[in-house]
């Protein structure tokens, strides 16, 4: 047959030759020829390639910069990049997690619906009728108003989304 015009999976076409791609974790040193195989070399320390490739340079592992609130979640290998996450109390600003911001706190009148993680911010929700939050917090949920009746007390001051009800003693002059 004549030299090929298309190649198999994990091969590439160059100079009318089907050459083997380099496996993940290795970079291309020289293309194959009529008489020689593709030559590949392992990526160095702190480098990686995550696909079958013909790259002549490996990629650098991501640096988890502590000055940006980042720390290593999973150390990179010759075949995988380093995965960064944020320090406690912080979360990533993007899917790539290139920097971190402090978790948002829920203001008074709002409670935590979902606690923040290393990759997602706090989700707040307004306290519904019957619930309140009087603090700014990244952890506190809306608390239910105190039930005066169960304490054999009466409501002296109505609750709001920011304050609890105020209970007081029963009026003893009741007929």
């Amino acid at each position: 047959p004549e030299p090929p015009t298309a190649c198999r999976e994990k091969q590439y076409l160059i100079n009318s030759q089907c050459c083997s791609l380099c496996q993940p974790g290795q970079k291309l040193v020289s293309d194959c020829t009529e008489f020689t195989e593709t030559e590949c070399l392992p990526c160095g320390e702190s480098e990686f390639l995550d696909t079958w490739n013909r790259e002549t340079h490996c990629h650098q592992h991501k640096y988890c910069d502590p000055n940006l609130g980042l720390r290593v979640q999973q150390k990179g290998t010759s075949e995988t990049d380093t995965i960064c996450t944020c320090e406690e109390g912080w979360h990533c600003t993007s899917e790539a997690c290139e920097s971190c911001v402090l978790h948002r706190s829920c203001s008074p009148g709002f409670g935590v619906k979902q606690i923040a993680t290393g990759v997602s911010d706090t989700i707040c929700e307004p306290c519904p009728v019957g619930f309140f939050s009087n603090v700014s917090s990244a952890f506190e949920k809306c608390h239910p108003w105190t039930s005066c009746e169960t304490k054999d007390l009466v409501v002296q001051q109505a609750g709001t989304n920011k304050t609890d009800v105020v209970c007081g003693p029963q009026d003893r002059l009741r007929a």
Partner: antibody, heavy 112, light 112 residues
Framework: EVQLQESGPGLVKPSETLSLTCTVS?????????WNWIRQPPGKGLEWMGY???????NYNPSLKNRVTISRDTSKNQFSLKLSSVTAADTAVYYC?????WGQGTTVTVSS | DAQMTQSPSSLSASVGDRVTITCRSS???????????LNWFQQKPGKAPKLLIY???NRFSGVPSRFSGSGSGTDFTLTISSLQPEDFATYYC?????????FGQGTKLEIK
Amino acid sequence: EVQLQESGPGLVKPSETLSLTCTVSGYSITSNYYWNWIRQPPGKGLEWMGYIRYDGSNNYNPSLKNRVTISRDTSKNQFSLKLSSVTAADTAVYYCARLDYWGQGTTVTVSS
Amino acid sequence: DAQMTQSPSSLSASVGDRVTITCRSSQSLENTNGNTFLNWFQQKPGKAPKLLIYRVSNRFSGVPSRFSGSGSGTDFTLTISSLQPEDFATYYCLQVTHVPFTFGQGTKLEIK
């Protein structure tokens, strides 16, 4: 078009060192490929002597018992053959080759 | 070493004949990637060898389609489908899978 051209003395005395040079044009010897020396005694078949790779590393035919050295001069795009302690059995046509392209060959006679 | 045995060592044939030359290796020429580096060359008297076939079955550029190669592992074949006057020459197989590279002893194709 890739071209290879052998040069060197056609007559070498027994026990001396045979030295040949191959000048390559149309392709850099540092780009890729293995650059070979092959010989053919009169009326006989072809014998691979060794190569120097694009990166400068070598491989030799063990049958030549450490008598062979292949080196290169990248500034001149040349590679060279040295064969020490020659005898009449080393009389042959010597070819330099990339295997897809060959020099025309040079005859070396070992005689006193 | 991979010893290469060609047969026949000589062959008489006529123009228009179909000719087959075989080459057998003492060990498999398939490498770990599944590639086999077996080549065929044609040499005419006083000339350098010319590459005909590389990697078992690939025709080198400019080689007529009447030349074809086949085989795998240890057994390989060069076929000339319809001999032309210019095809009378000596043919060599060469393996470059294993170092040292080794040639077959040659097959001389003569006019009957």
